[in-house]
């Protein structure tokens, strides 16, 4: 393990998973590293092996229990350490006292479906996955629609500042193929970030009726 510029970032999915990424410039690909979790008020310790995801980046998931079980609370602290093997010993490369509900990243929304589609509008719904009941309604969403001839990066973001698991897209073009994505973020947590984007939902608006104004 070379002393390059390193970064250790972890997020809690609010239920039973802590996902971590460790990056280090100049580190050898075959360096053996792991994340060790030591909670302050739980009986368990957990370790996961960091596996390469790119040239200088490794990731692993600390799976704390069944996907929908509430394994940590707002008062928990979990000390997370990156340990890398150097010869016969393990060296601490990074350490943080991790507060799960200050470092949230939820799972991507799932079960996207078209509820109703017309020539100029489309109503879409979705569900959140493995989200803690602690949030109650304190969630927000961002959505984006991919129009023909554009990229996802160009798509304007629609913000839903409340727990609203549906959207009505307006001013669409008739008989046109679109794609739609949504992501979610709890309002809680200094280091909380957006979930990954959902899988895109493809839909097509209805064609305009012949001989009528559109």
């Amino acid at each position: 393990a070379v002393n390059g510029t390193s970064q250790f970032t972890c997020f809690y999915n609010s239920r039973a998973n802590i996902s971590c990424v460790w990056s280090q410039d100049g580190a050898l690909q075959d360096t053996s590293c792991q994340v060790h979790a030591w909670p302050d008020r739980r009986r368990w310790n957990q370790t996961c092996e960091l596996l390469p995801v790119s040239q200088a980046s490794w990731a692993c998931n600390l799976i704390l229990g069944a996907p929908d079980s509430q394994k940590l609370t707002t008062v928990d602290i979990v000390t997370l350490r990156v340990l890398c093997r150097e010869g016969v010993r393990w060296r601490v490369m990074a350490i943080q006292d991790f507060k799960p509900f200050e470092n949230l990243r939820l799972m991507a929304p799932i079960s996207l479906q078209v509820v109703h589609v017309e020539t100029h509008r489309c109503n879409i719904s979705w569900e959140i996955s493995q989200a803690s009941h602690y949030f109650e309604r304190h969630l927000e969403f961002e959505a984006r629609t991919l129009s023909p001839g554009h990229t996802w990066e160009e798509a304007p973001l629609l913000t839903l500042k409340q727990k609203q698991e549906w959207i009505c897209l307006e001013t669409l073009t008739p008989d046109t193929q679109y794609e739609f994505q949504v992501r979610v973020k709890p309002l809680q947590g200094e280091f909380t970030t957006w979930s990954p984007w959902s899988q895109p939902l493809a839909f097509r608006t209805k064609p305009a009726a012949l001989g009528k104004d559109t």
């Epitope: 393990a1 390193s6 250790f8 000390t79 350490r81 060296r91 943080q96 507060k99």
Partner: nanobody
Framework: QVQLVESGGGLVQPGGSLRLSCAAS????????MSWVRQAPGKGLEWVSS????????YYAESVKGRFTISRDNDKNTLYLQMNSLKPEDTAVYYC???????????????????RGQGTRVTVSS
């Protein structure tokens, strides 16, 4: 904005003790790793000790290990450095420092220091 105010420095004889304090404000203190660094007369900044956000991990420079103890009181937003068995070579201005995240990197202990206070002077002399 981040404010770090050190106190507790002074003149002490070799073998004596001092306790430095650092009052922090302007950020969620318990969410950040903290450290003490020092600057001896005519020298550069030297890392002394670091502590994780909840105080569960502490690290020390070899030159102070066994003599200095870092601690924190998150209810009081205060960082401490207990200095025992002081030596003339400990003479320096001591700065309280905040890291840019909750993470501390032991192999590169000065990395990520984002803010520091005005410092408190410690003189060890007979």
């Amino acid at each position: 904005q981040v404010q770090l105010v050190e106190s507790g420095g002074g003149l002490v004889q070799p073998g004596g003790s001092l306790r430095l304090s650092c009052a922090a404000s302007g950020f969620t203190f318990s969410n950040y790793a903290m450290s003490w660094v020092r600057q001896a007369p005519g020298k550069g900044l030297e890392w002394v000790s670091s502590i994780t956000g909840a105080g569960r991990g502490t690290y020390y420079a070899e030159s102070v290990k066994g003599r200095f103890t870092i601690s924190r009181d998150n209810d009081k937003n205060t960082l401490y450095l207990q200095m025992n068995s002081l030596k003339p070579e400990d003479t320096a201005v001591y700065y309280c420092a905040k890291y840019d995240s909750s993470t501390f990197y032991p192999p590169t202990p000065a990395r990520g220091i984002a803010d520091r206070g005005q410092g408190t002077r410690v003189t060890v002399s007979s």
